[in-house]
Amino acid sequence: SRLRQEDFPPRIVEHPSDLIVSKGEPATLNCKAEGRPTPTIEWYKGGERVETDKDDPRSHRMLLPSGSLFFLRIVHGRRSKPDEGVYVCVARNYLGEAVSHNASLEVAILRDDFRQNPSDVMVAVGEPAVMECQPPRGHPEPTISWKKDGSPLDDKDERITIRGGKLMITYTRKSDAGKYVCVGTNMVGERESEVAELTVLER
């Protein structure tokens, strides 16, 4: 087939962007290319071609008409992590090929088990009280908040400081007594620790 004057090699006009997606959620890595004849698009992850519904109708990855890669759900296990990695799209026609920028797909996770649950604390009125927890492993790293008797703790109270996994009450009042729960949160959701009881004794 001879070269036609109006034909031109592929060029990527929309590059994929880095993504952080929760396990089980859908996701799209965008890619759009121009060229004449219209280029075919293939995706590669870590140098290996990515299988899509074009290869196996049961695949959870679909190659969209635009060239974008659509994940029906992000698959991510304790060991096998087939969707996580660095992707590129490659557009080809008989005049050549164009390769997109790298795009990393990271999977957001939040494990169930707290690395450290808070323990019961007993203090006298006016004394400081400290509770400590280490939330479940997660990506992105979970933020920590606390609940008292089922309601979010008022951290605007100047006596209360939350730093890392530590809850510090500089001087306790009788009203501080109750059931405390540590909460770890990221884009996946939230996890609550076991309950710890703060007992405040009269002097």
Partner: antibody, heavy 118, light 105 residues
Framework: EVQLVQSGAEVKKPGASVKVSCKAS????????MHWVRQAPGQGLEWMGW????????EFPQKFQGRVTMTRDTSITTAYMDLSRLRSDDTAVYYC???????????WGQGTMVTVSS | DIVMTQSPSSLSASVGDRVTITCRAS??????LNWYQQKPGKAPKLLIY???SLQSGVPSRFSGSGSGTDFTLTISSLQPEDFATYYC???????FGGGTKVEIK
């Protein structure tokens, strides 16, 4: 089509070694852990260990440590299981199995019968 | 190691029966439990993953339940092709239960 195709049956003498291969096709080989499971005649399923095809990392239960070796060749998308110092009670069907992202063995090889007999 | 105990080791049932197989873990495994079916001379086949999720292509008469240490596989109405051996597996340490053979009464 996603499939695992294993090498053929083997007959070995006690003390020898056996190497079973498992050719993967239809999916990204390095994205999924590969496991080996065996089944002695009339018995249940026994997990032997895994290999991460991406980097070659392996893990085996205590029972098989020092006697089993798992390797892979990513260029031909094939995993291997080598069992040494064979005994008669190693007579079994050996399966390779892919671990899905749902933490289950969703694709299995057809099995390789290994007979250890003097 | 987490030990998986399956019961019963065998059972006899008729076509149309409701069949229940149980699996107990020696310590909590959350929902990390899978169920497989195996027929003589064949490789096992995944039925249920994550305790209760039905694998694609598996008939809806199969269902799984439980979390922590106690799990159940239920076949709501036994069909002739369901006579086989069933195995549970925990996907933390990957060990299998001893199996339950479902035979024709």
């Amino acid at each position: 089509e996603v499939q695992l195709v294993q090498s053929g049956a083997e007959v070995k003498k006690p003390g020898a070694s056996v190497k079973v291969s498992c050719k993967a096709s239809g999916y990204t080989f390095t994205g999924y852990y590969m496991h080996w499971v065996r089944q002695a005649p009339g018995q249940g399923l026994e997990w032997m260990g895994w290999i991460n095809p991406k980097n070659g990392d392996t893990e085996f239960p205590q029972k098989f440590q020092g006697r089993v070796t798992m390797t892979r060749d990513t260029s031909i998308t094939t995993a291997y299981m080598d069992l040494s110092r064979l005994r008669s009670d190693d007579t079994a069907v050996y399966y390779c199995a892919r671990e899905s992202g749902d933490d289950a063995f969703d694709i299995w090889g057809q099995g390789t019968m290994v007979t250890v007999s003097s | 190691d987490i030990v998986m105990t399956q019961s019963p080791s065998s059972l006899s049932a008729s076509v149309g029966d409701r069949v229940t197989i149980t699996c107990r873990a020696s310590q909590s495994i959350s929902s990390y439990l899978n169920w497989y079916q195996q027929k003589p001379g064949k490789a096992p086949k995944l039925l249920i993953y994550a305790a209760s999720s039905l694998q694609s292509g598996v008939p809806s008469r199969f269902s799984g339940s439980g979390s922590g240490t106690d799990f159940t596989l239920t076949i709501s109405s036994l069909q002739p092709e369901d006579f086989a051996t069933y195995y549970c597996q925990q996907s933390v340490g990957l060990f299998f239960g001893g199996g339950t053979k479902v035979e024709i009464k």
